[in-house]
Interface confidence: low
Amino acid sequence: EEELQVIQPEKSVSVAAGDSATLNCTVSSLIPVGPIQWFRGAGPGRELIYNLKEGHFPRVTPVSDPTKRNNMDFSIRISNITPADAGTYYCVKFRKGSPDVELKSGAGTELSVRAKPSAPVVSGPAVRATAEHTVSFTCESHGFSPRDITLKWFKNGNELSDVQTNVDPAGKSVSYSIRSTARVVLTRRDVHSQVICEVAHVTLQGDPLRGTANLSEAIRVPPFLEVTQQSMRADNQVNVTCQVTKFYPQRLQLTWLENGNVSRTEMASALPENKDGTYNWTSWLLVNVSAHRDDVKLTCQVEHDGQPAVNKSFSVKVSAHPKEQGSNTAAENTGTNERNIY
């Protein structure tokens, strides 16, 4: 008499989350009499998946009619698969008795569940950095299975190489997460730059998911300062200009000091953008030369994006201009608040 064989032809089956999985099992003989049961896992902790005779298994249905005479096909279909269903399933033959005795197990079929990764979320540095500095961007995606996944970083369409990626856990799990960090060296031209995290997975059928971050959130472009004197006006007033150029972000405060004393403070707002995303700003101060006996030291002081103030000074030569007799008043501030003349 030939020994009973329990045949599970597939070593592994891969199913998309939400689909049905068919687990095949046939027996080589109708003898001895006894039921077939399906389990997930082996050993004492195994989980009963299907038992024709008793129990309620709403998601499991037999592929063929198990009640028909001479049935030797005990394949099952599990509906609405989730990542939690992953594991190795065993078709086990029992000999009828009180209780039934386990006789033979199939070799097992590994069910892996294909679950889509979540949309990648890209986060940048907590504080801004200036050009030539390196900043890190992090990309995370979760809930995918199987574990195989590809993640690439791009900056303005060019793939980045300074990347470190981890998929967790390393061991068996119903689903996985990926976390990747890309290091990007900033340049002054990066205000309009973008980094993209691209995730490719078998469940996405060649259409990768993308997460993006704008380098404008990570970069600070400090301003250039230039202070110049316009020609003397007929009314003995000198127009001094402070040009603040190529800065980002817009958050900027400008203070004029005359001989160290605050003359006027202005805040930048509603500035038009340069092509590269930076901003320019021009501020004027009118100095009444006739009101001063000595040269006037004018300082343009700029505080940009909460950084320490940057100063640029200029001396107006009073000695070169005739003075009004008996005048000892402070320099008259008639400076306008006009901005951004290009």
């Epitope: 592994s12 902790g45 078998v202």
Partner: antibody, heavy 121, light 107 residues
Framework: EVQVLESGGGLVQPGGSLRLSCAAS????????MSWVRQAPGKGLEWVSA????????HYADSVKGRFTISRDNSKNTLYLQMNSLRAEDTAVYYC??????????????WGQGTTVTVSS | EIVMTQSPATLSVSPGERATLSCRAS??????LAWYQQKSGQAPRLLIY???TRATGIPARFSGSGSGTEFTLTISSLQSEDFAGYYC?????????FGQGTKLEIK
């Protein structure tokens, strides 16, 4: 019959290179992660490297990182281990093994008989 | 990397008796642990995966237990073919690492 068969071992001088191959048969090669494990004479097992079923993910032991490269050709059902800058301590029997899934879980349930690599001047 | 430590290095047991082999991880590896048997001159054979699940074709006298950092392989009634080397291996963190092995010999 499910089996894997290693080849490519031999005697090589320190600093030299060698490429090991592992031919698989009897199973859907691309569905299974593969690994190289070595065993120095009289010593225990040392995990060397692993590659996922698709080949998109690879991992290495610290002792071989930067010197060894694992790869696979699923169209030829073959696994490779390119070994460069070989050292005397790389002398061992190198086993090819298949994981029981495509993603490194469960352990390695199919093993070859091994190929011997000797690094000596 | 995670260091796996097996004890004892050598275990002498009589046929028919129970053998208990231990494996300790330097940090938690959850249940991601496998046991292998290796006979002299042969390739290793997978016995247990997932810390406690027997691989296909492995006799019921082999059982694994434990999780986290402490694991045990028990052979309930030793047969002559069971005298061999035994290795644990964690597959929770890269790089995967083996224990140094336990040699099971006839007493």
């Amino acid at each position: 019959e499910v089996q894997v068969l290693e080849s490519g071992g031999g005697l090589v001088q320190p600093g030299g290179s060698l490429r090991l191959s592992c031919a698989a048969s009897g199973f859907t090669f691309s569905s299974y992660a593969m690994s190289w494990v070595r065993q120095a004479p009289g010593k225990g097992l040392e995990w060397v490297s692993a590659i996922s079923g698709s080949g998109s993910s690879t991992h290495y032991a610290d002792s071989v990182k930067g010197r060894f490269t694992i790869s696979r050709d699923n169209s030829k059902n073959t696994l490779y281990l390119q070994m460069n800058s070989l050292r005397a301590e790389d002398t061992a029997v190198y086993y090819c093994a298949a994981y029981s899934g495509s993603y490194y879980y469960y352990g390695m349930d199919v093993w070859g008989q091994g190929t011997t690599v000797t690094v000596s001047s | 990397e995670i260091v796996m430590t097996q004890s004892p290095a050598t275990l002498s047991v009589s046929p028919g008796e129970r053998a208990t082999l231990s494996c300790r991880a330097s940090q938690s590896v959850s249940s991601n642990l496998a046991w292998y048997q290796q006979k002299s001159g042969q390739a290793p054979r997978l016995l247990i995966y997932g810390a406690s699940t027997r691989a296909t074709g492995i006799p019921a006298r082999f059982s694994g237990s434990g999780s986290g950092t402490e694991f045990t392989l028990t052979i309930s009634s030793l047969q002559s073919e069971d005298f061999a080397g035994y290795y644990c291996q964690q597959y929770n963190n890269w790089p995967y690492t083996f224990g140094q092995g336990t040699k099971l010999e006839i007493k």
